[in-house]
């Protein structure tokens, strides 16, 4: 039967002490397949001491030793009599420290030392010697085992196929005895019937100490390249993967951290444990609680799942997101954490399951850890919040984590920056109630810092200007926000985005936060002073030639630079212009950049959204007489009348009140004329007087543009799709947003700004208009 | 090295019994299994009952209930009581020890008849 001490070796099982469980399997009977063990290490003691700072002498005892000694006086002849007993028995002394085997029994020596706690002289000399005696008795007992294993190999085999299940019981605990010596444990490993025979023996048993031998066998040879080849050709993957249905606690953990050994070290195990139904379940084990199981479970589903689509949507299937997420709730293990951690970070990469871990509240499960002191569990939170967060943003009870996450926008670490930010931009994406919340705890300052802390790093600085151009519009502080951009001086820094070295999308975002930011009447002036409507004009012009270069060679497709398409620069531009010639030193810097032609000539654009801000912006245009008569002689009404039949009925309005601006000092007849004319094209359903509605286009979009300029287009990009985030190779898996990375190699020189009428000229210091470098890709919520 | 010597066995009408006797001479380890196996001519030796050391018996399906095994350690001999037999019972039945020693040593007996037959 089991000796008490294997007994012992798994009883931890059987603890109803968690605790003691828990350290139970810290020591070295459970081997624990690498991934809890260094934490527990010290180097070795080259002295054999063990560890040096367990060591410290106590003075205290030192000092009474010394009292104690020397507290009796001796005698002269005393002391000559000690000294002749000490020389007449040195040879004794000698050969007991060195050889105390070859000593009579019985035989007593005097000691030099008082107390006999502290080694005498001749016993520390003797240490290396008695350290080469142990190391050549390990060699010969390592012979001896191996000899008697070699021997007891083919005997012990047949009994394992013995039809006596008591006699496969008993062979089964003498083969993981055998297991436990190094020796003997190579012997078996390189007998092919041997470990073909424990496996077989363990997938068939019914006996709860067989399957308990078995399985631990294999898991001390699987702690040898030799023993996991073995283990892999004997068929035991799916032997032990059968055991992970066991009810016996040791059993269950002998095969887990077996076949965790497995996947880390053998080709072939991950396909050959997915195909034995592993992941189904391994998913089911995730019930139990024992952490440090847990923690072993959870990196086996890591190591499957990562890079393999299939093993994700099993994984899913089999309730694996919904148990993932409660762990990251009940446990405190760091360990464990991390590696739940892990596994969510590449299921979150995963279409399907992003849903899935967000509905089973991951988002708020994984915020609870980003102020952990472990780094790399905070570092995994992130990346996964920042995969998940595109798809979570209809979740509710967000305030915690939004909270934390502009916290950590002022971290020093650029990752955690770079993460919150971007989870940030996402979550604020088309939910007003995020936006209130961010706005309360001080996300406009936090985020306004960020960019000005990051510099030309777009990586932060766009998911960042994405962000508050989110929090500048559509809720009840939008306002404010608006506002305090200006109050924490932020605006030279806004505007200073829209210059190189920023990239498409990091220009299209500024655009479309300074658009929002105009729409507080106070912004006005600080942006006119920032030089953001030469700026905005000469990127309009740049876009717009884009555009007009690929439609005259033919082509109707938009095409994307760096991700970004020109139409939505074009549009964004044209729309920030328009909220700012709402002030009339603005209209007249818009004006006086000779800008109305192209206005005009936007009005033909085959886009809606673009007839609208371009007819927007000369509605505002159109309020001063100069202007007015400008568009005129540019020949608007023609595509302005157009314009009046438009379905959209933003275009249709706003057209129809530059027609009125312009018609302002027109005879009575043609005001008349063209009264009947905008009122039979205006109000086809509902007819009303014209001058009742003078100043309906005036404040449209000034409400939140509901007539689809999009402040909140998320354009989210998903790096993952290409499989982008290895995690081996430490370039984790980016969040759902558009964050441009700098591109290299490309430096955009400014000049002073060129005259209009130069075109070329507007083409220095303008990012490439073509780029091979990685396309993003936009898609809205 | 290790003997067996059996005993008993016979010929016996259906539903009789008989007896066989086990014993071991030599140097005998205390961790081992004693037990019976029969095989028929031109069979495979087929697992009949066995008990360890500590008294942990095991039966063939096909002969629980009916069988019975028991052990005197003190006397390193096995005995097996076969109640209601049947003619498929009829074989040659043969003791063995197994030795759990590094390595394992089998002894095998010398063999008894047992016939079941009206």
């Known amino acids: 039967m089991a000796t008490q001490a294997d007994l012992m070796e798994l009883d931890m099982a059987m603890e109803p002490d968690r605790k003691a469980a828990v350290s139970h399997w810290q020591q070295q009977s459970y081997l624990d397949s690498g991934i809890h063990s260094g934490a527990t290490t010290t180097a070795p003691s080259l002295s054999g001491k063990g560890n040096p700072e367990e060591e410290d002498v106590d003075t205290s005892q030192v000092l009474y030793e010394w009292e104690q000694g020397f507290s009796q006086s001796f005698t002269q002849e005393q002391v000559a009599d000690i000294d002749g007993q000490y020389a007449m028995t040195r040879a004794q002394r000698v050969r007991a420290a060195m050889f105390p085997e070859t000593l009579d029994e019985g035989m007593q020596i005097p000691s030099t030392q008082f107390d006999a706690a502290h080694p005498t002289n001749v016993q520390r000399l003797a240490e290396p010697s008695q350290m080469l005696k142990h190391a050549v008795v390990n060699l010969i007992n390592y012979q001896d085992d191996a000899e008697l294993a070699t021997r007891a190999i083919p005997e012990l085999t047949k009994l394992l196929n013995d039809e006596d299940q008591v006699v496969v019981n008993k062979a089964a605990v003498m083969v993981h005895q055998l297991s436990k010596k190094e020796a003997s444990r190579h012997a078996i490993m390189r007998s092919p019937q041997m470990v073909s025979a424990i496996v077989r023996t363990m997938q068939n048993t019914n006996d709860v100490e067989t399957a308990r031998c078995t399985a631990g066998t294999l898991h001390n040879l699987s702690h040898h390249r030799e023993g996991l080849l073995a283990i892999f050709k004997s068929g035991g993957i799916p032997a032990l993967v059968k055991m992970l249905g066991s009810p016996v606690d040791s059993v269950l953990f002998y095969a887990i951290t077996t076949l965790h050994n497995l996947l880390l070290h053998q080709e072939g195990a991950k396909m050959a444990v997915r195909l034995a139904g592993g992941l189904q379940k391994m998913v089911a084990l995730l019930n139990k609680t024992n952490v440090k199981f847990l923690a072993i479970t959870t990196d086996c589903l890591q190591i499957l799942a990562y890079g393999n689509q299939e093993s994700k949507l099993i994984i899913l299937a089999s309730g694996g997101p919904q148990a993932l997420v409660n762990i990251m709730r009940t446990y405190t293990y760091e360990k464990l954490l991390w590696t739940t951690s892990r596994v969510l970070k590449v299921l979150s990469v995963c279409s399907s399951n992003k849903p899935a871990i967000v509905e089973a509240g991951g988002m708020q499960a994984l915020g609870l850890h980003l102020t952990d002191p472990s780094q790399r569990l905070v570092q995994n939170c992130l990346w996964t919040l920042r995969n998940l967060s595109d798809a979570a943003t209809k979740q509710e009870g967000m305030e915690g984590l939004l909270g934390t996450l502009v916290q950590l926008l002022g971290s020093d670490d650029i990752n955690v920056v770079t993460c919150a930010a971007g989870i940030l931009s996402n979550l604020t994406c088309n939910n007003y109630k995020n936006k209130m919340m961010v706005c309360q705890v001080g996300g406009i300052e936090a985020l306004v810092r960020t960019v000005l802390r990051a510099g030309d790093r777009e990586d932060i600085t766009e998911p960042a200007i994405c962000a508050l151009r989110h929090l500048t519009s559509r809720h009840q502080e939008a306002e404010m926000a608006q506002n305090a951009v200006r109050l924490h001086y932020g605006l030279p820094v806004v505007v200073k985005l829209l210059h190189p070295p920023s990239h498409w999308p990091l220009i299209k975002a500024t655009v479309g936060l300074i658009r929002n930011l105009a729409l507080c009447p106070a912004n006005h002036a600080p942006l006119r002073e920032q030089g953001a409507i030469p700026r905005l004009v000469q990127l309009l012009v740049r876009a717009h030639q884009d555009t007009q270069r690929r439609t005259s060679m033919g082509g109707t497709q938009q095409q994307f630079v760096e991700g970004v398409r020109m139409e939505e620069i074009v549009e964004g531009c044209t729309g920030a212009l328009h909220i700012l010639a709402r002030d009339v030193h603005n209209r007249i810097v818009i004006r006086g950049l000779n800008t109305i032609p192209l206005f005009v000539q936007l009005l033909y654009s085959p886009i809606e959204n673009i007839q609208r801000v371009a007819a927007g912006v000369l509605c505002e245009l159109a309020q001063d007489k100069e202007a007015a008569e400008a568009i005129e002689a540019e020949g608007a009404t023609a595509p302005l009348t157009e314009l009046l039949h438009s379905r959209n009925e933003g275009v249709a309005t706003y057209a129809a009140a530059v027609l009125f601006r312009m018609s302002e000092d027109k005879p009575q007849d043609y005001k008349k004329r063209l009264s009947v004319e905008l009122t039979s094209s205006l109000f086809r359903t509902e007819p009303m007087a014209w001058n009742e509605t003078a100043d309906l286009g005036l404040d449209i979009g000034a409400q939140g543009e509901p007539l689809g300029y999009r402040q909140d287009d998320p354009s989210y990009r998903s790096f993952h799709s290409g499989g982008y985030g290895q995690d081996a190779l430490g370039m984790d898996p980016m969040m759902e947003h558009e964050m441009g990375g700098h591109h290299p190699g490309a430096d955009y020189p400014v000049d002073g700004l060129p005259d209009l009428g130069h075109a070329q000229d507007l083409m220095d210091g303008l990012p490439p208009g073509d780029s091979n470098q990685l396309a993003w890709f936009d898609t809205d919520l | 090295q290790v003997q067996l010597v059996q005993s008993g066995g016979g010929l016996v009408q259906p539903g009789g019994s008989l007896r066989l006797s086990c014993a071991a001479s030599g140097s005998i380890s205390s961790n081992n299994v004693m037990g019976w196996y029969r095989q028929g001519p031109g069979k495979q030796r087929e697992f009949v009952a066995s008990?360890?050391?500590?008294?942990?018996?095991n039966y063939a399906a096909s002969v629980k209930g009916r069988f019975t095994i028991s052990r005197d350690n003190a006397k390193n001999t096995v005995n097996l009581q076969m109640n209601s037999l049947r003619p498929e019972d009829t074989d040659v039945y043969y003791c063995?020890?197994?030795?759990?020693?590094?390595?394992?040593?089998?002894?095998w007996g010398q063999g008894t008849q047992v016939t079941v037959s009206s």
């Open positions: 063995r020890l197994t030795m759990m020693t590094y390595p394992p040593i089998i002894s």
């Open positions: 008990i360890t050391d500590s008294d942990l018996a």
